[in-house]
Interface confidence: low
């Protein structure tokens, strides 16, 4: 049946839905201040503007009942159900921001003739790349694999001399849903990363990852994996790691490396950390304040999607120009829009850019130290720091492979 | 229609003190972070201190400690007050959203300090 979308004649609506099934374990009413926020600042901005017209948001729940393992494997029905419910009520608003599952994304991009903008807050694995009415505002797998090729290749900074060509990647299973589809991206045989290296092995027992790190027989120094530093600390403990070890721990939506008080544990020194630029550090809204870092990246994720409608919707009426098009639902892309934290790029394909931070601990001060940047949208490496202060023999980063000379 | 009226400066000698007003009107004050920034007319503006919704507050490195930043969200009014002022505290201050600055600038609020 058709399904009717609230969508002009000054009222523009938009359809949430609160998915018990999410990419993290964050309470619905936190999503919903986030949403009502964006709201806010949106209507503020519409009314600064001179656009007289009124912008609200549908909150669609799900009822909880069948898909209710609140983490991403039950999300693909669930994501279907709520389109069926919004079908059954016969109301559609003009965009439609919720699935953060990438399996419930899939299936609904896949299931529906979407003939609007769909914005989540994760999606982040492969299958939900080049989607063309399906904006991300959370930096998806493609974005990481892209620099892990980016950074292996790179041989001519003064503390990495060497281009690599192998990795380990250690995946267990219980990954965080952001980490399950990243390593996914790593491990997959057809993927760009898989593609561009020589040598590259999955690690999937605990006891396979903590033996790599003193064989000799190793068949590369580097390994690959995702979490806290909690997370490698539980994995590794004060275990002895060969010299020539690299860890890269992807954490990406941690900001705790920047806070001014935060010591290095020593079991990180051989570790590099790949998270996101933070945020303007004085971030610290109500509807974020009583969130971890992680959760704070999502909820601004949903706050930011209020804000790219906001200011697509702006451009559309300033041009006289109909909501309810096909141009309408492939716009969300291509553009830099402000964010709730400044200012927010998306890729041709709608995806989110963003700067990643590359961080060493200091042997001498134990604190975090950013190596180098990396900026997604144009795929280049900035070296921050030429003179790290690395465990690693002569502040350089060793080769990846014991033994073998200058590439 | 947006507006924000900057008030309070004027001119103070070297450790002298300020409170600047900024009211607003044709905003939903109380959902706002706002900010105080400073800045010569047509320049790059540059925050000096932010308030939540909530009412948390963050300063400039160069102004900690000397200024405070304060808001009345039922008069929707936010404050700055400046205390021990330095002569490198002169330029005109306006108030604005943070971050984003996405309201129309208003006319600011001079302050200079000299002996």
């Known amino acids: 049946s058709q399904v009717s979308q609230n969508c002009h004649n000054g009222s523009y609506e938009i359809s949430v839905l609160m998915m018990g099934n999410s990419a993290f374990a964050e309470p619905l009413k936190n999503l919903e201040d986030a949403v009502n926020e964006g709201l806010e600042i949106v209507r503020g901005r519409l009314q600064n503007a001179g656009l007289n017209v009124t912008v609200n948001a549908t909150f669609m729940y799900s009822d909880g009942l069948i898909h209710n393992s609140g983490d991403c494997r039950s999300s693909t029905c669930e994501g279907l159900d709520l389109l069926r419910k919004i079908s059954n009520a016969q109301r559609m608003g003009c965009v439609l921001i919720g699935p953060s599952c990438t399996y419930s994304t899939f299936q609904m991009y896949l299931d529906t003739e979407l003939s609007y903008p769909m914005i989540s807050a994760g999606s982040f694995g492969l299958s939900c790349d080049y989607k063309e009415t399906l904006t991300r505002l959370m930096s998806p797998a493609r974005k990481l694999m892209y620099f892990l090729v980016n950074f292996w290749k790179t041989n001519d900074l003064p503390f990495k001399t060497y281009s690599w060509s192998t990795s380990y990647v250690y995946k267990n299973g219980t990954e965080t849903e952001d980490c399950f589809w990243y390593l996914n991206a790593l491990e997959a045989s057809v993927s760009y990363f898989s593609h561009e290296l020589g040598f590259k092995v999955v690690l999937r027992q605990d006891k396979e990852f903590q033996d790599i790190l003193m064989d000799h027989n190793r068949k590369s120094n580097v390994i690959i994996m995702c979490g806290g530093p909690e997370f490698l600390y539980k994995l590794k403990g004060d275990r002895a790691v060969a010299e020539d070890i690299v860890i890269i721990l992807v954490d990406l939506f941690n900001d705790q490396y920047f806070e001014d008080n935060v010591t290095a544990p020593d079991y990180m020194k051989n570790v590099l950390v790949l998270t996101l630029s933070p945020g303007n550090s004085l971030l610290n809204s109500s509807f974020s304040r009583n969130l971890s870092p992680t959760k704070r990246d999502f909820a601004l994720a949903y706050l930011n999607g209020i804000l790219l409608f906001g200011h697509m919707l702006k451009i559309f009426l300033e041009n006289g120009e109909n909501i309810t098009t096909p141009k309408f639902a492939h716009a969300f892309r291509n553009l830099t829009f402000e964010g709730y934290d400044g200012p927010v790029t998306l890729d041709d394909w709608g995806d989110v850019d963003s700067t990643m931070v590359l961080l060493y601990t200091s042997v001498d001060t134990k604190k975090y130290k950013v190596l180098l940047t990396y900026d997604t949208h144009v795929n280049k490496t900035y070296p921050v720091d030429m003179s790290p202060t690395f465990t690693w023999k002569n502040s350089k980063l060793p080769n990846d492979i014991t033994g073998r000379g200058p590439q | 229609q947006v507006q924000l009226v900057e008030s309070g400066g004027g001119l103070v000698q070297p450790g002298g003190s300020l409170r600047l007003s900024c009211a607003t009107s044709?905003?939903?004050?109380?959902?706002?972070?706002m900010g105080w920034y400073r800045g010569a007319p047509g320049k790059q503006r540059e925050l000096v201190a932010r308030?939540?919704?909530?009412?948390?507050?963050n300063y400039a490195d160069s102004v900690k400690g000397r200024f405070t930043i304060s808001r009345d969200n039922v008069k929707n009014t936010m404050y700055l007050q400046m205390n021990s002022l330095k002569p490198e505290d002169t330029a005109v201050y306006y108030c604005n959203r943070f971050p984003g600055a996405t309201f129309s600038w208003g006319q600011g609020t001079q302050v200079t300090v000299s002996s």
């Open positions: 308030i939540t919704s909530g009412g948390d507050t």
């Open positions: 044709g905003i939903i004050f109380h959902i706002y972070t």
